[in-house]
């Protein structure tokens, strides 16, 4: 079954290439778990960024080796994407699953257009 | 390749305990629910008892509950079945199988025979 | 605890022959339902998720339809692979719940 799924339309990633942003699910069950996907899509291909599966009211864990973390609140996951360049560019797109136990709900967002610019290197100094 | 491999069946006596395992690969075993699902001899499909992906959620069929305990170790990606007070209409093969929106995969099972 | 009823209980048919099973929950369970596919002395394969969505690696002569409470599984042409027991399985409202099954037999 569908489930909506709300994001933000643009962020702008930071100097160090990090970038937040909070995915939002209006869920129709009462799930005990919910795995959270980041999607990448650029030039029409789809990757998946990182992946995470949580209990209701517990924090989100990714593997140790993701660029993502985040933090969950009732039906709000705040996302966080680190290690970003300017050809990280792209719409990152949130997919929610409400896993068990039974009905099963899929849930996919718009997507979020992250921008990220690679900071100008700093101009040698001459004294 | 997602693979389910189940061990741990055997004879036991009616009032006996059996510990079932079942060791997964394949896939990110923490993400997705697991179930233990019989099939007496002859007979039809029964589902047993589930335990969601972090464990912090069990399920059980009336027919067992209070008796079987489901259990996981994330860590060693295995599922357990802890079956004490074993009666004879226990007596099945006894399948782990991977819960998405379906059963989408199964063990070969192993069989529990409860018989004096 | 939702109860799910097939029919029939078996059949025979020939290979070729159209086969069509039927599935029914004691209430609606919208399109959570799913099909399995057993052979004697192995583990179930699941066919079709989702009332209608085909497992990857399943051939196409399969197919699933129905929503609410009826639902269908046909075989379009039976091949001699085929010949199995089906089993229908709820999964839109826990415990998950099973069909009595339907044994597909050689004409």
């Known amino acids: 079954k569908a489930m909506h799924v709300a994001q933000p339309a643009v962020v702008l990633a930071s100097s160090r290439g990090i970038a937040s942003f909070v995915c939002e699910y209006a869920s129709p069950g009462k799930a005990t778990e919910v795995r959270v996907t980041v999607l990448r899509q650029a030039d029409s291909q789809v990757t998946e960024v990182c992946a995470a599966t949580y209990m209701m009211g517990n924090e989100l864990t990714f593997l140790d080796d993701s660029i993502c973390t985040g933090t969950s609140s009732g039906n709000q996951v705040n996302l966080t994407i680190q290690g970003l360049r300017a050809m990280d560019t792209g719409l990152y797109i949130c997919k929610v699953e409400l896993m068990y136990p039974p009905p099963y709900y899929l849930g996919i967002g718009n997507g979020t257009q992250i921008y990220v610019i690679d900071p100008e290197p700093c101009p040698d100094s001459d004294f | 390749e997602v693979q389910l491999l189940e061990s741990g069946g055997g004879l036991v006596q009616p009032g006996g305990s059996l510990r079932l395992s079942c060791a997964a690969s394949g896939f990110t075993f923490s993400s997705y629910a697991m179930s233990w699902v019989r099939q007496a001899p002859g007979k039809g499909l029964e589902w047993v008892s589930a335990?969601?992906?972090?464990?912090?959620?069990?399920y059980y069929a009336d027919s067992v509950k209070g008796r079987f305990t489901i259990s996981r170790d994330n860590s060693k990606n295995t599922l357990y079945l802890q079956m004490n007070s074993l009666r004879a209409e226990d007596t099945a093969v006894y399948y782990c199988a991977k819960r998405y929106i379906a059963f989408d995969y199964w063990g070969q099972g192993t069989l529990v025979t409860v018989s004096s | 605890d939702i109860q799910m009823t097939q029919s029939p209980s078996s059949l025979s048919a020939s290979v070729g022959d159209r086969v069509t099973i039927t599935c029914r929950a004691s209430?609606?369970?919208?399109?959570?339902l799913n099909w399995y596919q057993q052979k004697p002395g192995k583990a179930p394969k699941l066919l079709i998720y989702?009332?209608?969505s085909l497992q990857s690696g399943v051939p196409s002569r399969f197919s699933g339809s129905g929503s609410g409470t009826d639902f269908t599984l046909t075989i379009s042409s039976l091949q001699p692979e085929d010949f199995a027991t089906y089993y229908c399985q709820q999964g839109g409202m826990p415990p998950d719940t099973f069909g009595q099954g339907t044994k597909v037999e050689i004409k």
């Open positions: 989702a009332a209608s």
């Open positions: 335990i969601s992906g972090s464990g912090g959620s069990t």
């Open positions: 209430q609606s369970i919208s399109s959570y």
